[in-house]
């Protein structure tokens, strides 16, 4: 019989319910912003945002300083009463909408939903290795500002994201804002702006270039500003907006935005939608060409990948790449393929697919009938006229207009829908060695840090753990301080390390030491951990051989057994040849010689399963003893594998010896053209790997085995004789003299 | 470390003029904004005059606005105070003052050691 | 011009004990006030500005506190080097005005 080793899942190498618990802050309230801040001296500040207050943390999470943002009108706000006496607006709580850096100052800006979204800058005194902020200034001149023009007015109450440039000695605010009718009416703010920071800290520079949904379009196009970020000579924003202004304002898709970070100028803003799709590599029947469409961006990051993504997305390890996290509509609701698909976008190649976009718009000859776009936010017109104008003059570009790139830049979901159910709602994507990891946070407040690789059919996991009991949804906003990344959920601000929260999650000593060399992870006798976790047993460089099944569980005390072991790190080579004497198996006292892997039985094993086989023939000893016994498998002066060598013992027990006994063989005779179907009645019949039934040395086949029991169909015989009928178990004979009549037919 | 140094005080009788320098080092002078504040013997503070950083934002205390005028060096990094028409309620030690950072209006954060002034006949 | 009053001209106190010195303003300055301490001979040095930030290096036995028209400065657990003059300015209208000062000498 062909017997083999069950598959374990892969999965059963892992457990992802183990708890860790990783530093956190109670910050009273839900985190509506969250900012990290690392100085030159070593000095590091976490600030974290809720409903009217403003925490300063230090590097290990602790409150170092509170500072109150609201309610607007209250005696107690203090950044309010840096705006010299009120009243100022009406009152109100504030909800911080922006939270940045001014990396020039260094200091941090809040602007909040009260007081006309005015900002607050707040200089960073390092104090160790704390930072203490500074008392606010107002960055707010009421003698400039106007409901109808209103530089000071920044952020929008339906979100507002900022991305902070330096250009000389100036700083320059890059502010995108969701606007609705009713926000539009109440000072003014603008949908894409740029404003210089005036030097004095006291709000910013009038006459700032700006781009803003036309009043027609406010009540229908609504704008959603997801992200934003800098890199290189642009400033990046990713929104969530209508695919037309005139077609149904619920279908929604995802642009870029990109703007020049180094002239204050929107003549070259241009636009690209970024299209991201799930392709499975099998297509359902009804399924759409080119794979299903996940329009809406929920969240998106963009860093340096390691060498093999980069070689996967063919760019140059350390490039820039945007990742996004994509869902098929707004509430993100279960479609036919995963819930989240993530997608990467070289920016390059979106840099490389915008200036063609701008040559194809006005570069000769001219395409008929290609339109400028952004209708929203211009008048309609065809390249390479600008906005609302029917030629170009001689002294106008057709380049010094914002521009919708008219073709999209299409993607599929690196992940190969894998991440199934799982809906992300947080994203930040770290470089650790030459290898790319997508920290992920969760609808459910779990985190899973994933490699990023597109060639597999499963997810490589760093780790899948739940911040807390609380199971809220982890927020979208991530930051970086140090070796850690920060993620609220609710009202509380977790630090988990980039390299993972431990290593208790690998089960297995083989699962362990293949963990990333980044993790830190050693086997302790029993248990994956970090060294800190176990010094005294702790090592990376081998594994003990694991034996989790073998077959048969019984074999004759007489006579040879053919043993199958099963389990993992029997050879860490895929062909699993074994070289001389380094694998030696007992039964009992009785040794097990190695067998020669029969090459033609290897079959490939998806990784996503694992068993490792191996094969001995078990000879027992004269002194070996009828009754159970343990299988014993030691690996010795094994050549080092990829990731550690084999070495070690593993015990299993419920081998048993036993003695076949033949009690009666019926009927003795039969017809001399054979078939006769005998039964062979006794004791332990079926232990062991072989037998056989010899009717005058000639095999009777066997058509049905049990351990008290055998029927086989005779063979025919030469003669009409009385012939010798005996029973082989594992080539020894079972005692006892039988014989067979062969009579007439 | 923040250095303020004034100097050009002296005796002088009414009427007549002195010019008062406060040489800064240190810190990035064409950033910050510049105070004069005098105090007279066994007397309280008073604000006299400041500068912005580019000279276009100058403010007085109204009563020695026609009398005094400041002004900067940038390239210099300095300071400078002149005083016309002096009285003998102008005897004081004048400090030159630099602003909290670059944008807390009024608020000094680091003084010079101060210069005399005295007007007498 | 708004007028600073600092009522108490003299406080007395001993080492090791807390100690409050009032200002009032005389219309809402908000929380643009500073404090300032100066000792015999020297310049003054500044402790708390925006009512309630304690400057870089203040020893935190300094707290401000206080907006609109009444700030305390409180010293607790007193030290011989406290021993001073001290006093407030508001900066939220032209012209700056400082307070009369506060001398702080032992018992």
């Known amino acids: 019989e062909d017997w083999q080793c069950p598959r374990t899942p892969y999965a059963a190498s892992r457990d992802f319910d183990v708890k860790y618990v990783v530093p956190s802050f109670s910050a009273g309230g839900l985190v509506q912003a969250m900012v990290t801040y690392e100085g030159d001296r070593n000095e590091s500040a976490v600030f974290v945002a809720i409903r009217n207050r403003l925490h300063v943390l230090g590097p290990d999470l602790k409150s170092v300083q509170s500072l109150a943002t609201g309610p607007a009108g209250d005696p107690g706000c203090q950044t309010c009463a840096a705006c010299g006496p009120g009243p100022h607006g009406p009152p109100g709580d504030t909800d911080t909408k922006v939270l940045v850096l001014d990396p020039a100052l260094p200091a941090l800006v809040s602007c909040g939903s009260s007081l006309q979204g005015r900002c607050f800058l707040h200089d960073l005194e390092p104090q160790g290795t704390a930072v203490h902020l500074a008392a606010p200034a107002c960055l707010f001149s009421a003698h400039h500002n106007r409901p109808d023009d209103c530089p000071d007015c920044v952020a929008s109450p339906l979100g507002t994201r900022v991305t902070v440039v330096e250009q000389g000695q100036a700083s320059y605010f890059y502010v995108a804002s969701s606007l609705d009718a009713a926000v539009a009416a109440s000072f003014s703010p603008r949908s894409v702006s740029i404003r210089r920071l005036k030097a004095d800290a006291s709000g910013f520079a009038p006459g700032f270039v700006a781009l803003s949904v036309l009043p027609k379009h406010l009540v229908s196009y609504s704008i959603e500003y997801v992200h934003s970020f800098h890199t290189g000579a642009f400033v990046y924003f990713l929104t969530v907006q209508p695919a037309s202004v005139t077609d149904d304002p619920s279908a929604l898709h995802t642009r870029l935005a990109r703007l020049s970070a180094t002239e204050p100028e929107l003549g070259d803003y241009r636009e690209l939608v970024l299209d991201c799709r799930f392709a499975p590599k099998r297509r359902r029947r009804g399924a759409p060409e080119g794979g299903q469409p996940y329009p809406v961006l929920r969240v998106a990051h963009s860093a340096p990948v390691g060498a093999q993504l980069a070689t996967e997305l063919s760019i140059a390890e350390g490039q820039e790449v945007l990742f996004g996290v994509f869902v098929t509509g707004k509430d993100g609701g279960p479609g036919v393929g995963p819930n989240s698909v993530v997608c990467a976008f070289p920016i390059d190649l979106l840099d490389t697919l915008i200036d063609e976009g701008v040559e194809r718009c006005c570069e000769s000859p001219v395409h008929p009938g290609l339109r400028r776009g952004l209708d929203f936010f211009q008048s309609p017109s065809f390249c390479p006229n600008p906005p609302g104008l029917e030629a170009l003059s001689p002294n106008t570009s057709c380049r010094h207009f914002p521009l919708l790139v008219s073709s999209s830049f299409s993607r599929v979901d690196l992940f190969n829908g894998l991440l199934g159910p799982v809906q992300v709602t947080a994203l930040y994507v770290t470089r650790l060695d030459n290898v790319t990891v997508a920290h992920m946070g969760t609808m459910d407040g779990r985190i899973l840090q994933v490699e990023l690789v597109r060639s597999l059919n499963y997810l490589l996991y760093v780790s899948n753990f739940s911040l807390g009991d609380s199971g809220q949804p982890v927020q979208r906003d991530v930051s970086r301080l140090g070796d850690h990344l920060l993620f609220a959920s609710g009202d509380q601000v977790f630090q988990v390390p980039i390299q993972g929260p431990g290593c208790r999650h690998f089960l297995t000593c083989g699962r362990c030491l293949r963990a990333w060399h980044f993790m830190g992870c050693g086997w302790c006798g029993n248990m994956c951990g970090q060294q800190k976790e176990c010094p005294g047993s702790w090592q990376q460089d081998h594994c003990p051989p694991k034996l989790t099944e073998f077959h048969p569980h019984s074999g004759p005390l007489r006579g040879s057994t053919r043993l199958t072991l099963c389990g993992s790190n029997f050879y860490l080579h895929p062909s699993g040849l074994v070289p001389e004497g380094t694998h030696q198996v007992t039964v009992g006292q009785s040794p097990c010689r190695p067998l020669p892997k029969d090459s033609s039985k290897l079959r490939p094993v998806p990784r996503k399963d694992f068993v490792e086989e191996f094969e001995c023939e078990l000879e027992p000893l004269g002194t070996q003893a009828v009754g159970p016994t343990n299988v014993s498998l030691t690996v010795t002066n094994m050549p080092p594998g990829k990731h550690f060598r084999v070495d070690g013992t593993s015990v299993l027990r419920g081998f048993s010896f036993m003695e076949p006994v033949l009690i009666a063989v019926q009927p003795l005779f039969g017809p001399r053209a054979g078939g006769t179907c005998l039964t062979l009645e006794g004791q332990s019949l079926s232990v062991g790997t072989s037998r056989a039934v010899l009717v005058n040395g000639t095999e009777c086949l066997l058509a049905r085995v049990s351990e008290g029991q055998l029927l086989c169909a005779t063979p025919p015989g030469a003669t009409v004789a009385s012939v010798p009928l005996s029973l082989q178990v594992g080539g020894a004979q079972v005692p006892g003299s039988w014989t067979f009549q062969y009579r007439e037919d | 470390e923040v250095q303020l140094v004034e100097s050009g005080g002296g005796l002088v009788q009414p009427g007549g003029s002195l010019r008062l320098s406060c040489a800064a080092s240190g810190f990035d002078f064409s950033r910050h904004w510049m105070s004069w504040v005098r105090q007279a013997p066994g007397k309280g503070l008073e604000w006299v005059s400041e500068?912005?950083?580019?000279?276009?934002?100058?403010n007085y205390t109204p009563s020695l606005k026609e009398r005094f005028t400041i002004s900067r060096d940038n390239a210099k990094n300095s300071l400078y105070l002149q005083m016309n028409s002096l009285r003998a309620e102008d005897t004081a030690v004048y400090y030159c003052?630099?602003?909290?950072?670059?944008?807390?209006?009024?608020?000094?954060?680091?003084w010079g050691q101060g210069t005399t002034v005295t007007v007498s006949s | 011009d708004i007028v600073l009053t600092q009522s108490q001209k003299i406080v007395s106190t001993s080492v090791g004990a807390r100690v409050s010195v009032t200002c009032k303003a005389s219309?809402?300055?908000?929380?643009?006030l500073v404090w300032y301490q100066q000792k015999p001979g020297q310049s003054p040095k500044t402790l708390i500005y925006s009512a309630s930030f304690r400057y870089s290096g203040v020893p935190d036995r300094f707290t401000g506190s206080g907006s609109g028209t009444d700030f305390t400065l409180t010293i607790s657990n007193v030290q011989s080097e406290d021993l001073a003059d001290y006093f407030c300015q508001q900066y939220n209208n032209y012209p700056l005005t400082f307070g009369a000062g506060t001398k702080l000498e032992l018992k």
């Open positions: 003052a630099r602003r909290v950072r670059i944008h807390y209006y009024g608020a000094m954060d680091s």
């Open positions: 219309q809402n300055v908000g929380s643009s």
């Open positions: 500068i912005n950083p580019d000279s276009r934002t100058i």
